[in-house]
Interface confidence: medium
């Protein structure tokens, strides 16, 4: 099918960082300067993506790739392809409409990223408070009374508490 | 290129389950918080469901909770919805979205859509 | 249950300016975010937190706030911007995800 394709279609062979110009009897065309094409046998260029603002180049525009865009200092990335940047906090603070705050009693942030979460409740684990929380940092969980026999050193980490790194793809 | 895809949808009796797929490409789906958006016909956005990116926080609308669940497997980049006794109104074209970062806030904005697996519930 | 309020619709001539408001009681608290749907296409992010612009979005559209009100400004309005404008926002005590009516947005 593949080939039977190309046969009726030229505009098939035209490879990536090309587009299928029909303006000139179908002939392969080099995408023209901030734009490319990813893909083959496209019949037209994609425009480059353009970081600019608050937005800073991570990569350049090629003739078969996007532009990507971070933000800059003070600022991170949001969303999948970072298509939005936002203003960072300190730890132990989240971002609201108001401004920086800082986490309630029982919360905690340790980025300066996202939200206050709720310190990890140890009981629920049937363990006992090692570490208290703080605004910056969760409980360290460790064991429970009952559980400190001779010997018994265990200390239960929290779960997860940073947000996984977000790189721009 | 970034990109959600929906399956599982299609005409099913009240009372009866459906399990609907989002398969993501072109990003880093453990990354992100994942939500279900759904719209009527001809009708307004209605927010169903959202799953943060380790699974440790999840948030239903009231008109689901009980009935609907959200899950997903990072290590197949996959969303899924879960819907139990379903019901006339929950006939709706379903969208899986992106949240802004990786934990699930109600303030979140719903950033890259796929477009959409429809869901009919009539007898 | 909490309401975002949306006109129903809203015409515009070319090169005109639109405005589409929406009404909460918890905005001047919560951020709003704006997305523009086309028939039969996926909504599209076009403002966050009340008055940013993601990449991409033309620099015709802002985003503004006044106390109860947000407001979405379409500059220069062109054919292409014919569409359906959702609001959404959280209530304040942040509980709930809520979206607005919708406003049909008639370029004439």
């Known amino acids: 099918f593949e080939r039977t394709r190309s046969l009726q279609d030229p505009c098939s062979n035209c490879p990536a960082g090309t587009f299928c110009d029909n303006n000139r009897n179908q002939i392969c065309s080099p995408c023209p300067p901030n734009s490319f094409s990813s893909a083959g046998g496209q019949r037209t260029c994609d425009i480059c993506r353009q970081c600019k603002g608050v937005f800073r180049t991570r990569k350049e525009c090629s003739s078969t790739s996007n532009a990507e865009c971070d933000c800059t200092p003070g600022f991170h990335c949001l969303g999948a392809g970072c298509s939005m940047c936002e203003q960072d906090c300190k730890q132990g603070q989240e971002l609201t409409k108001k401004g920086c705050k800082d986490c309630c009693f029982g919360t905690f942030n340790d980025q300066k990223r996202g939200i206050c979460r709720p310190w990890t409740n140890c009981s629920l684990d049937g363990k006992s408070v090692l570490v208290n929380g703080t605004k910056e940092r969760d409980v360290v969980c460790g064991p429970s009374p009952a559980d400190l026999s001779p010997g018994a050193s265990s200390v239960t980490p929290p779960a997860p508490a940073r947000e996984p790194g977000h790189s721009p793809q | 290129e970034v990109q959600l895809v929906e399956s599982g949808g299609g005409l099913v009796q009240p009372g009866r389950s459906l399990r609907l797929s989002c398969a993501a490409s072109?990003?880093?789906?453990?990354?992100?918080?994942m939500h279900w958006v759904r719209q009527a016909p001809g009708k307004g956005l209605e927010w169903v469901s959202g799953?943060?990116?380790?699974?440790?926080?999840?948030g239903y609308a009231d008109s689901v909770k009980g009935r609907f669940t959200i899950s997903r497997d990072n290590a197949k980049n996959s969303l899924y919805l879960q819907m139990n006794s379903l019901r006339a109104e929950d006939t709706a074209l379903y969208y899986c979205?992106?949240?802004?970062?990786?934990?699930?806030?109600?303030?979140?904005?719903?950033?890259?859509w796929g477009q959409g697996t429809m869901v009919t519930v009539s007898s | 249950s909490y309401e975002l309020t949306q006109p129903p619709s809203v015409s515009v001539s070319p090169g005109q300016t639109a405005r589409i408001t929406c009404s909460g009681d918890a905005l001047p608290k919560q951020y709003a975010y704006w997305y523009q749907q086309k028939p039969g296409q996926a909504p599209v992010l076009v403002i966050y937190?009340?008055?940013e612009r993601p990449s991409g979005i033309p620099e015709r559209f802002s985003g503004s706030s006044s106390g109860t009100t947000v407001t979405l400004t379409i500059s220069g309005v062109q054919a292409e911007d014919e569409a359906d404008y959702y609001c959404q926002s959280a209530d304040s005590s942040g509980t709930y995800q809520v979206f607005g009516g919708g406003t049909k947005l008639t370029v004439l």
């Open positions: 937190k009340d008055s």
């Open positions: 979205a992106t949240g802004l970062g990786g934990w699930l806030r109600i303030d979140d904005a719903f950033d890259i």
């Open positions: 799953i943060s990116w380790n699974s440790g926080s999840i």
């Open positions: 072109g990003f880093t789906f453990g990354d992100y918080a």
